[in-house]
Amino acid sequence: RTTTCFGDGCQNTASRCKNGGTWDGLKCQCPNLYYGELCEEVVSSIDIGPPETISAQMELTVTVTSVKFTEELKNHSSQEFQEFKQTFTEQMNIVYSGIPEYVGVNITKLRLGSVVVEHDVLLRTKYTPEYKTVLDNATEVVKEKITKVTTQQIMINDICSDMMCFNTTGTQVQNITVTQYDPEEDCRKMAKEYGDYFVVEYRDQKPYCISPCEPGFSVSKNCNLGKCQMSLSGPQCLCVTTETHWYSGETCNQGTQKSLVYGHHHHHH
């Protein structure tokens, strides 16, 4: 957020940028949480996403029997490892081809025992509030498909007729990690020292990180004719003075007519 400054006062402004704002020759460049000519105001809403996509990672182990293990397979830059990776990836792409959330596989380690393949299956889905269910379902389908292929594609008479063959008993799912998206946590973090006063409210299933100074939400503070301003002690109403009235009170709802006050003073004189 930026505010431009013109004229002689600009040099003075430069040294007065607040809250970590920096002077760029024309204006104070404010950090995300602040705005105003001197970055003196706290924003009332923070963009917290959501992210476009959510990812999941499944740690799996399968045993490939159609390749004999050699020491070169331990070296990820070797010709042998690179070729194994290519064939294994192609085979897994076929296995998981019906899963829209499937992104690919990443081999983490190859070890002896025919060839024991420790790898991650990577999943991704567009963010919706139901993303956990979508990814949970996808992980179940991954389990079903890998179990099926490692049961069906097996060596017969010490020969494999498929692209790869497996040991039926060597298939294990070690761990499943879903990227957590927690709007409340994100909101609190991004609001920094004002975190206690920012909350998440939803509109059309989209989360908004707002302070009570943001109008139009259930937590919004009504300052009437005043201005809502955030401070470290929370949101406060700054009341205005018009030509005819002074306003006061916590929500600037108490108006005092100037003429009455002046009239009262005159009466005493």
């Epitope: 159609s66 390749v67 050699t70 007729s161």
Partner: nanobody
Framework: DVQLVESGGGVVQPGGSLRLSCAAS????????MAWFRQAPGKEREVVAF????????YYADSVKGRFTISHDNSKNTLYLQMNSLRAEDTAMYYC?????????????????WGQGTQVTVSS
């Protein structure tokens, strides 16, 4: 990258013999797999035989057992297929295939490197 060049194909009478060769280059190790596949017109590519260059394993398709012999010369990095007692049904394009892995599969999709092929025709 691995390169394979076949030679030795030709026309031969039933009962005759041919020797196919396949020169390999580009390997970083002296232990890998090489194979002969063949493909007759209108049919799928099928394995004929494979060998591990460390001598650890050879395999023959049932249809060629006792008639064909696969071998490898490590000093020349060359694969051979000695074909005896040839039959009309052996007529096909013969391909050399290779892998830097010690493969135990006869599925062509598992073999990443291929030559251009050499034609073998058995006809009287």
């Amino acid at each position: 990258d691995v390169q394979l060049v076949e030679s030795g194909g030709g026309v031969v009478q039933p009962g005759g013999s041919l020797r196919l060769s396949c020169a390999a280059s580009g390997y970083t190790s002296n232990r890998y797999s090489m194979a002969w596949f063949r493909q007759a017109p209108g049919k799928e590519r099928e394995v004929v035989a494979f060998i591990w260059t460390d001598g650890g394993r050879t395999y023959y398709a049932d249809s060629v057992k006792g008639r064909f012999t696969i071998s490898h010369d490590n000093s020349k990095n060359t694969l051979y297929l000695q074909m005896n007692s040839l039959r009309a049904e052996d007529t096909a394009m013969y391909y050399c295939a290779a892998s830097s892995l010690l493969l135990q599969t006869i599925n062509p999709r598992a073999w990443p490197y291929w030559g251009q092929g050499t034609q073998v025709t058995v006809s009287s």
